[in-house]
């Protein structure tokens, strides 16, 4: 687990859970409702969602030097998306099907974030900017956009954990 002082997370566990997240994110994406792509804005909502960027220390060298920076960034993103998936955007109307993978996705995001941050230690989490509340007519597009950006986020996280499991595990 990633704890203050530079301890390593359970890389293999994180790798397995992040791979599961990738699968769930892709399976949830087409199930959030009919999406007319013409409704999308020209801009992406890049300011609204967390991204793993070059300066976040998630490259192989950065992970070797100090994995905490990258892990904190991943943790922030996981919490961000976990909150979104628990918000009225996903829980409100139009209702998701009872067997929708979104519920599993939500639980897995929480599970991986807890692997990265044990109780008693609190990393600063990113605020959710004006993404809630919403009305039903807005939600299909919001779900679509959020899941699409989540796919990209968990894909990068999975690569980080795969690298960590292969090269940084004790």
């Amino acid at each position: 687990r990633a704890v203050p002082g530079g301890s390593s997370p359970a890389w293999t566990q994180c790798q397995q859970l992040s791979q599961k997240l990738c699968t769930l994110a892709w399976s949830a994406h087409p199930l959030v409702g009919h999406m007319d792509l013409r409704e999308e804005g020209d801009e992406e909502t890049t300011n609204d969602v967390p991204h793993i960027q070059c300066g976040d220390g998630c490259d192989p060298q950065g992970l070797r030097d100090n994995s905490q920076f990258c892990l904190q960034r991943i943790h922030q993103g996981l919490i961000f998306y976990e909150k979104l998936l628990g918000s009225d955007i996903f829980t409100g109307e139009p209702s998701l099907l009872p067997d929708s993978p979104v519920g599993q996705l939500h639980a897995s995001l929480l599970g991986l974030s807890q692997l990265l941050q044990p109780e008693g230690h609190h990393w600063e989490t990113q605020q959710i900017p004006s993404l809630s509340p919403s009305q039903p007519w807005q939600r299909l597009l919001l779900r679509f956009k959020i899941l699409r950006s989540l796919q990209a986020f968990v894909a990068v996280a999975a690569r980080v954990f795969a690298h960590g499991a292969a090269t940084l595990s004790p």
């Epitope: 909502t45 004006s130 039903p136 807005q138 299909l140």
Partner: antibody, heavy 122, light 107 residues
């Protein structure tokens, strides 16, 4: 006092362009979705377009898709509607609106501007 | 698209009358419906939101009911200032759609 003030309407020839503006005051503009609604003379209300607080998500009525573009400048507290390839059937009073009802907010805003008239005619 | 059908298109009534306007959605919209009042040359004014919630500052003689596809706006005792056009509007899915309007006229 929450206020919306539209401008930019006028007479334009078919195929022409206009840009409407809506200046907002009295509330935190960047927190809220905004929209445009229009009303042809003697007719009912028609929703035109909406935009998410960040500006990154937009919605349009089929009748204006590909011709109209909604945008906002949160630093200027201003909402815009760029209207291209205008047709006679776009002739209407255009209202800018802030409508938060039903969205789980405690503050139920439903504020409309006074409207700006757009006439498309040769 | 969800069609909103309002009836009647116009109604003649006297001060003190009870007036009922109905709105039917072409598919279920839960309670995502609002009622607006509009007077000539003015912007619409919200009366009722979420099918039955009275907007702040709106007199209690206005009330809304219904869920799913059938909705009603009732004015319990018509006042002189209530002569106007009334619109219903759904916000369940895009495009957001309004009813055709009901004109309440003086008998």
């Amino acid at each position: 006092e929450v206020q919306l003030l539209e401008s930019g309407g006028g007479l334009v020839q078919p195929g022409g362009s206009l840009r409407l503006s809506c200046a907002a005051s009295g509330f935190t503009f960047s927190k809220y979705s905004m929209e445009w609604v229009r009303q042809a003379p003697g007719k009912g209300l028609e929703w035109v377009s909406s935009i998410w607080p960040s500006g990154g998500l937009t919605w349009y009525a089929d009748s204006v898709k590909g011709r109209f573009t909604i945008s906002r400048d949160n630093s200027k507290n201003t909402l815009y509607l760029q209207m291209n390839s205008l047709r006679a059937e776009d002739t209407a009073m255009y209202y800018c609106a802030l409508r938060t009802w039903g969205s789980g907010n405690n503050d139920v805003f439903d504020i409309w501007g006074q409207g700006t008239m757009v006439t498309v005619s040769s | 698209d969800i069609q909103m059908t309002q009836s009647p298109s116009s109604v003649s009534a006297s001060v003190g009358d009870r007036v009922t306007i109905t709105c039917r959605a072409s598919q279920g919209i839960s309670s995502w419906l609002a009622w607006y009042q509009q007077k000539p040359g003015k912007a619409p004014k919200l009366l009722i939101y979420a099918a039955s919630s009275l907007q702040s500052g709106v007199p209690s003689r206005f009330s809304g009911s219904g869920s799913g596809t059938d909705f009603t706006l009732t004015i319990s005792s018509l006042q002189p200032e209530d002569f106007a056009t009334y619109y219903c509007q759904q916000s369940y899915s895009t495009p957001l759609t309004f009813g055709g309007g009901t004109r309440v006229e003086i008998k």
